[in-house]
Interface confidence: medium
């Protein structure tokens, strides 16, 4: 369970491994704020709504974000 209920950073662990986009319910990018000084990327999986935190510095994660962004722009009119 990578989340906390505190008004601080959300993630407990971060992964360098990308998730399978087909298993993905949603992908949230939370910008740095007064509560958390770093960007957090939270992937919500379809199964049980499990949330996984991804390392924004990882090359594989950056590639995943590009792929998801490209897929979204294809879908939008």
């Amino acid at each position: 369970v990578p989340l906390s209920r505190t008004v601080r950073c959300t993630c407990i662990s971060i992964s360098n491994q990308p998730v399978n986009p087909r298993s993905l319910e949603k992908l949230e990018i939370i910008p740095a704020s007064q509560f958390c000084p770093r960007v957090e990327i939270i992937a919500t999986m379809k199964k049980k709504g499990e949330k996984r935190c991804l390392n924004p510095e990882s090359k594989a994660i950056k590639n995943l974000l590009k792929a998801v962004s490209k897929e979204r722009s294809k879908r939008s009119p």
Epitope: V1, P2, L3, S4, R5, T6, R8, C9, C11, I12, S13, I14, S15, N16, Q17, V19, C36, R38, K48, E50, R52, N55
Partner: antibody, heavy 119, light 111 residues
Framework: QVQLVESGGGVVQPGRSLRLSCAAS????????IHWVRQAPGKGLEWVAV????????FYADSVKGRFTISRDNSKNTLYLQMNSLRAEDTAVYYC????????????WGQGTLVTVSS | NFMLTQPHSVSESPGKTVTISCTGS????????VQWYQQRPGSAPITVIY?????PSGVPDRFSGSIDSSSNSASLTISGLRTDDEADYYC??????????FGGGTKVTVL
């Protein structure tokens, strides 16, 4: 390979303090949430505390809240457990365990360090 | 508070199948994932099942996990029981976000 090595255990009197350490190697320590789990002699596993990869979040079992403090030094790849106001019921083997980076289970455990609280 | 209850012990002969139950109370067991840890005498625990029914690499397929929502329980099944399966087995899930809960453990004896 991944290694977690606990140290700092020993015999201590009730009411006193002790600090445990867990030296980590073989993985990206600064990405991983780490837990402390304890086991009283002849008893089951009891979750104690977890700290987030960057140290910004800490969670404790009710049985240790207010007495134990979990912390980490990512520059030294080391996890700590500061135990204050120790009680006889804190006597246990204390394990540090690494949370799998992209999942919800403890994929590596140390061998444990024994803390005995006795007068 | 969410609690997990396991039988204290189970025993079976080599080659047979044994199933260990882990029953939740105070909440729904299928709300969060369940893990199973094996602890041989004098050793640290290792994970044999994670996320309800997934096996880490290196764990034989004789180990399997399942969830039964109707009985609010999880189960660990060990088939083709071997003498080196003799150990304590613990289920684990979550009370609420980031509060971990272990079952009391089940001692598996191979007769």
């Amino acid at each position: 390979q991944v290694q977690l090595v606990e140290s700092g255990g020993g015999v201590v009197q009730p009411g006193r303090s002790l600090r445990l350490s867990c030296a980590a190697s073989g993985f990206t320590f600064s990405n991983s949430g780490i837990h402390w789990v304890r086991q009283a002699p002849g008893k089951g596993l009891e979750w104690v505390a977890v700290i987030s990869y960057d140290g910004s979040n800490k969670f404790y079992a009710d049985s240790v809240k207010g007495r134990f403090t979990i912390s980490r030094d990512n520059s030294k790849n080391t996890l700590y457990l500061q135990m204050n106001s120790l009680r006889a019921e804190d006597t246990a083997v204390y394990y540090c365990a690494k949370l799998r980076d992209n999942g919800e289970y403890l994929d590596y455990w140390g061998q444990g360090t024994l803390v005995t609280v006795s007068s | 508070n969410f609690m997990l209850t396991q039988p204290h012990s189970v025993s079976e002969s080599p080659g047979k199948t044994v199933t260990i139950s882990c029953t939740g109370s105070g909440g729904s067991i299928d709300r969060n994932y369940v893990q199973w840890y094996q602890q041989r005498p004098g050793s640290a625990p290792i994970t044999v099942i994670y996320e309800d029914n997934q096996r880490p690499s290196g764990v034989p397929d004789r180990f399997s996990g399942s969830i039964d929502s109707s009985s609010n329980s999880a189960s660990l099944t060990i088939s083709g029981l071997r003498t080196d399966d003799e150990a304590d087995y613990y289920c684990q899930s979550y009370d609420s976000i980031n509060l971990w809960v272990f079952g009391g453990g089940t001692k598996v004896t191979v007769l």
